[in-house]
Interface confidence: medium
Amino acid sequence: MMTGTIETTGNISAEKGGSIILQCHLSSTTAQVTQVNWEQQDQLLAICNADLGWHISPSFKDRVAPGPGLGLTLQSLTVNDTGEYFCIYHTYPDGTYTGRIFLEVLESSVAEHGARFQIP
């Protein structure tokens, strides 16, 4: 039975040209995290594998930095970066947990962070 929950940074906004940290946290489970995939829609951004470390997609390696932790730092933001991001935790023995973050990249200088929320 999957008992864990994914806590994410929820709905967030950031300024065009700036950077943002995408962060998820898996709690309430003793399952071992074997790999975390970061995806935007169906596109791979990066993978953090427990044994192999980080692998950044060719499409993003010029502006994606690994970390902090299992999170991802997205740099040089453009309006096209607006959208859904998913952290996909591969765990043993529980299986897969998925968290969702919605990022809005704003033209203006007003960019406030949304509240945290949980996905069961």
Partner: antibody, heavy 120, light 107 residues
Framework: QVQLVQSGAEVKKPGASVKVSCKAT????????IEWVRQAPGQGLEWIGE????????YYNENFKDRVTMTRDTSTSTVYMELSSLRSEDTAVYYC?????????????WGQGTLVTVSS | AIQMTQSPSSLSASVGDRVTITCRAS??????LNWYQQKPGKAPKLLIY???SLHSGVPSRFSGSGSGTDYTFTISSLQPEDIATYYC?????????FGQGTKVEIK
């Protein structure tokens, strides 16, 4: 030594599916992506997609996304590429190749190729 | 997808000649470019990665250079065993794409 050994030639009718295998030996299977590239007769190289054997994460060229499925069997260090709804334009040699997990992206070892002929 | 345009599509040169192949990307690819050699009926073989790094075991007569959108592959002294088709390959953005190939023949 490193080897990628592919399954034998196939002849298929339009609308059918084909499943090509690629058996890896001589290296740590989970440490490398397996790439699939095809080459139509007398033509250049076209990337189909990739799979990371350790987790099964896979990413496909949009041109094939609706028709291709990549799977792996870690017990036999074998990767499979299945292409459905075949048409005559899919007649090609299909290659698997390996790409190291990490920051440099190149296909350093290739399978011998599998000729798939689609003909009514 | 990034388009890779290779030129020439074919060339004929004498043994010992210096041979140059160019590859132009439809947008900047930041040196994320490889070169492969393919002989008839065989799988491609990696020669150069990341624009100019020579893959292990590859003879030093092969070299690569370039930046931005324009890249060059050179064989400093053509040998009979170099008869093949050469492909550039960008990995700046998915999907990975290849040039259409340059067929090298001996005069």
């Amino acid at each position: 030594q490193v080897q990628l050994v592919q399954s034998g030639a196939e002849v298929k009718k339009p609308g059918a599916s084909v499943k090509v295998s690629c058996k890896a030996t001589g290296y740590t299977f989970s440490n490398y992506w397996i790439e699939w590239v095809r080459q139509a007769p007398g033509q250049g190289l076209e990337w189909i997609g990739e799979i990371l054997p350790g987790s099964g994460s896979s990413y496909y060229n949009e041109n094939f996304k609706d028709r291709v499925t990549m799977t792996r069997d870690t017990s036999t260090s074998t990767v499979y590429m299945e292409l459905s709804s075949l048409r005559s334009e899919d007649t090609a040699v299909y290659y698997c190749a390996r790409q190291k997990y990490g920051n440099f992206y190149y296909f350093d070892f290739w399978g011998q190729g599998t000729l798939v002929t689609v003909s009514s | 997808a990034i388009q890779m345009t290779q030129s020439p599509s074919s060339l004929s040169a004498s043994v010992g000649d210096r041979v140059t192949i160019t590859c132009r990307a439809s947008q900047g690819i930041g040196n994320y470019l490889n070169w492969y050699q393919q002989k008839p009926g065989k799988a491609p073989k990696l020669l150069i990665y990341y624009t100019s790094s020579l893959h292990s075991g590859v003879p030093s007569r092969f070299s690569g250079s370039g930046s931005g959108t324009d890249y060059t592959f050179t064989i400093s002294s053509l040998q009979p065993e170099d008869i093949a088709t050469y492909y550039c390959h960008q990995y700046s953005k998915l999907p990975y794409t290849f040039g259409q190939g340059t067929k090298v023949e001996i005069k």
